[in-house]
Amino acid sequence: ATKLTEEKYELKEGQTLDVKCDYTLEKFASSQKAWQIIRDGEMPKTLACTERPSKNSHPVQVGRIILEDYHDHGLLRVRMVNLQVEDSGLYQCVIYQPPKEPHMLFDRIRLVVTKGFSGTPGSNENSTQNVYKIPPTTTKALCPLYTSPRTVTQAPPKSTADVSTPDSEINLTNVTDIIRVPVFN
C-alpha cells in the first residue's frame, strides 16, 4: 500500500497553525468539512466541523480550533490557536459526503509543538500568548459520528497542487490541493 505523505510543521507554544485546505470543485462547496486528528492505531477523530450545509465564510469555533469555509473561493481555512505541546500529532481535513466515504483533502499534517515563548522579535502578533480574538458570530457545529475506515487504510495519490493534468473524479489529486501557511517557520 502507498504510504501517505506528511507535511511537517514545527511551531512553539502559543503560536497559531494556519492551513488552507483547497477543495476547488463547486460540488463540494456546501458539503460539511471536518478537521481530524489521527492517533496511532485508531480511527481518525473529528475535532471540529463546519455546519451542514456548510455556510460561507462563517467561522465555527470548537475550543481553540476555528474553521472558515470560503465557498466562493474553494477554501477551508483551519486555525489552531494558542498551540500547546499536547496538540502535537497528525491531522487531516476531510469533506463529508454521505452516503459516500469522506474525501481527504490533502497530505496529512504532522504538527510538532515545542515549549518556548513565541513572542520573540519579529513575531506575528497573531501568534503571541495573548487571547485570540474570535468574531462574535462563531458557532459550534454538530459533527457526524461516523469516520470512514478508508481514511486510515487507503492511501490516495500524493497531492500535487493544481497541476494541469487530465482530470478524474476518482483521482483525489485532481479534486483537491492545499497551500499550507504556518505563521512561523
Epitope: 488552507k20 476547488t24 472558515e68 470560503y70 473561493h73 494541469s164 473524479e169
Partner: antibody, heavy 121, light 111 residues
Framework: EVQLVESGGGLVQPGGSLKLSCAAS????????MHWVRQASGKGLEWVGR??????????YYAASVKGRFTISRDDSKNTAYLQMNSLKTEDTAVYYC????????????WGQGTLVTVSS | DIVLTQSPDSLAVSLGERATINCRAS??????????LHWYQQKPGQPPKLLIY???NLESGVPDRFSGSGSGTDFTLTISSLQAEDVAVYYC?????????FGQGTKLEIK
Amino acid sequence: EVQLVESGGGLVQPGGSLKLSCAASGFTFSTYAMHWVRQASGKGLEWVGRIRTKSSNYATYYAASVKGRFTISRDDSKNTAYLQMNSLKTEDTAVYYCTRDMGIRRQFAYWGQGTLVTVSS
Amino acid sequence: DIVLTQSPDSLAVSLGERATINCRASESVDTADYSFLHWYQQKPGQPPKLLIYRASNLESGVPDRFSGSGSGTDFTLTISSLQAEDVAVYYCQQSNEDPYTFGQGTKLEIK
C-alpha cells in the same frame, strides 16, 4: 489530454448576432466552470465571462462591456459551452478564446486556439 | 472592478539577465491570505500559457527561471536569466472577484 476547440466565428454586421461554441474533451466537463476571453488585434486580453456548474445553478457572470448583450450557456451532455453574442459592435471584433479553470476561482490552465469574430459593415 | 496595472509596458533585457514585471491591483486580490493572482505568457499567434498561479506557484512544465511573488495588491513576475524563447507579452490576471480582470500586458524583448 484536455482539449478546447472553438468554432462559429466569422464576419457579421454591426447589430447582428453570432453564436460561438467550445467543444471540450479530455476531462469531466460538468465539473468545471467555463470562461470566454477575447483579444482584439494587437491589444490585451479581456475576460468576457464565465458559467459555473450545475452545483452552482449554472450561474453566469459577465464583463461590463458585454453585459446584456452576450449570454454564456453550456450543455453538459454535449461537453460544450456557448457564447451567444447579440447587438454586436465593431469594438467586439477580436479573437475569442474558450478557457477552463482549475476549480473555483482558480487559474486558466487550458485554452482553446481561439476563433476570430469580425464585426464590420 | 479590480484594475490591474502592469509596469513597465515594455521591457528590453539582455540575454542571461534578470527581467522583472510588476502588477499592482486597485484593491486586494487575497482571500484568507491566499492570493488569486496569476501570470500568463503569450507569443504571437498563440493562446496565452499559464506560468504562475496564485502569485507564486510554478505551473507544471514551466522552467524554474520563472518565479512569482507578492500578496494583497503588489505582485512581481521574475525571469532570473532571460532566454531567447522568453520574448513574449506577459499578463497578470485576478480571479478573486467578478469580473475577472487582466493587466494591460508587458512586452518583453531582448536588448
